[in-house]
């Protein structure tokens, strides 16, 4: 039975050329996290495997850095980075939990962090 919830950084915005940390946190479950996938729409950005560690997709190697923790840091942001990002937690024995973050990359310096929210 899946009892866990994923808390994410929610809707966030950042300036073009800057960097942003995408962060999710799984709580309210005793399940063991075996892998976390980070995806942008249908593109795999990175995998953090409990045993093998981090793997960054080759096409994102220059602009994506692992961490902090199970999070992901996006660097040298462009307007094209605007969109949905997903953290997919593979857990034993619960199964898969998914969190969603919407990132807006702004041209100006009016970027503000959105409020945190939960996805059950």
């Amino acid at each position: 039975m899946m009892t866990g919830t994923i808390e994410t950084t929610g809707n966030i915005s950042a300036e073009k050329g800057g960097s942003i940390i995408l962060q999710c946190h799984l709580s309210s479950t005793t399940a063991q996290v075996t892998q976390v996938n980070w995806e942008q729409q249908d593109q795999l950005l990175a995998i953090c495997n409990a045993d093998l560690g981090w793997h960054i997709s080759p096409s994102f190697k220059d602009r994506v850095a692992p961490g902090p923790g199970l999070g992901l840091t996006l660097q040298s942001l462009t307007v094209n980075d605007t969109g949905e990002y997903f953290c997919i937690y593979h857990t034993y024995p619960d199964g898969t939990y998914t969190g969603r973050i919407f990132l807006e990359v702004l041209e100006s310096s009016v970027a503000e962090h959105g409020a945190r929210f939960q996805i059950p």
């Epitope: 039975m1 063991q32 075996t34 892998q35 593979h90 024995p93 199964g95």
Partner: antibody, heavy 121, light 106 residues
Framework: EVQLVQSGSELKKPGASVKVSCKAS????????MNWVRQAPGQGLEWMGW????????TYAQGFTGRFVFSLDTSVSTAYLQISSLKAEDTAVYYC??????????????WGQGTLVTVSS | DIRLTQSPSFLSASVGDRVTITCRAS??????LAWYQQKPGKAPKFLIY???TLQSGVPSRFSGSGSGTEFTLTISSLQPEDFATYYC????????FGQGTRLEIK
């Protein structure tokens, strides 16, 4: 080589306690959940539950609460199963088995060689 | 709880035979099914995960198929070392094993 080595057979009297050990080697102990499986004589496999090797948090399957305790000593990569107030019906082979994984798929591999616990007066 | 029912419970066959073991789940489990082989006095040996993916080192005469509620394990040409008991296991919700299928030499 990834392997699990369990402690030897035990002969116990009803009401006694037993502690079975399962020593892991060849991999990072805290990266893989550990399970316990019971097989009574001539019977099938019964999942007893598992322990989170990151947090030490145990989860017990139905029928295995109360007298059964899973624990860890991560410093020596060892999982333990303790059974208290032993009954004749606890006579069985007890296996530890590591959870293997690929993405969202899981399985048990490897398995320990099994520990026979016999409860008899 | 999800129950797994294996059929047959007992199977007698000869070397070279093609045999199929069926595992039915009481409710849909997608492809979250594994198969194991156990010989007398030994620990179970992992064969297949995700219903059809063969574990490294397992002979190709073993194959698995199915999704949802019905799954099969097939041995295309039985070898002497294949006579054993086979178990299916679901890993979709509250892990359970089938009752086992004992494969004996005819």
């Amino acid at each position: 080589e990834v392997q699990l080595v369990q402690s030897g057979s035990e002969l116990k009297k009803p009401g006694a306690s037993v502690k079975v050990s399962c020593k892991a080697s060849g991999y990072t102990f805290t990266s893989y959940p550990m399970n316990w499986v019971r097989q009574a004589p001539g019977q099938g496999l019964e999942w007893m539950g598992w322990i989170n090797t990151n947090t030490g948090n145990p989860t017990y399957a139905q029928g295995f609460t109360g007298r059964f305790v899973f624990s860890l000593d991560t410093s020596v990569s060892t999982a333990y199963l303790q059974i208290s107030s032993l009954k004749a019906e606890d006579t069985a082979v007890y296996y530890c088995a590591r959870t293997g994984y690929s993405g969202s798929y899981y399985w048990f591999d490897p398995w320990g060689q099994g520990t026979l616990v016999t409860v008899s007066s | 709880d999800i129950r797994l029912t294996q059929s047959p419970s007992f199977l007698s066959a000869s070397v070279g035979d093609r045999v199929t073991i069926t595992c039915r789940a009481s409710q849909g489990i997608s492809s979250y099914l594994a198969w194991y082989q156990q010989k007398p006095g030994k620990a179970p040996k992992f064969l297949i995960y995700a219903a059809s993916t063969l574990q490294s080192g397992v002979p190709s005469r073993f194959s698995g198929s199915g999704s949802g509620t019905e799954f099969t394990l097939t041995i295309s040409s039985l070898q002497p070392e294949d006579f054993a008991t086979y178990y299916c296991q679901q890993l979709n919700s509250y892990l359970t094993f089938g009752q086992g299928t004992r494969l004996e030499i005819k």
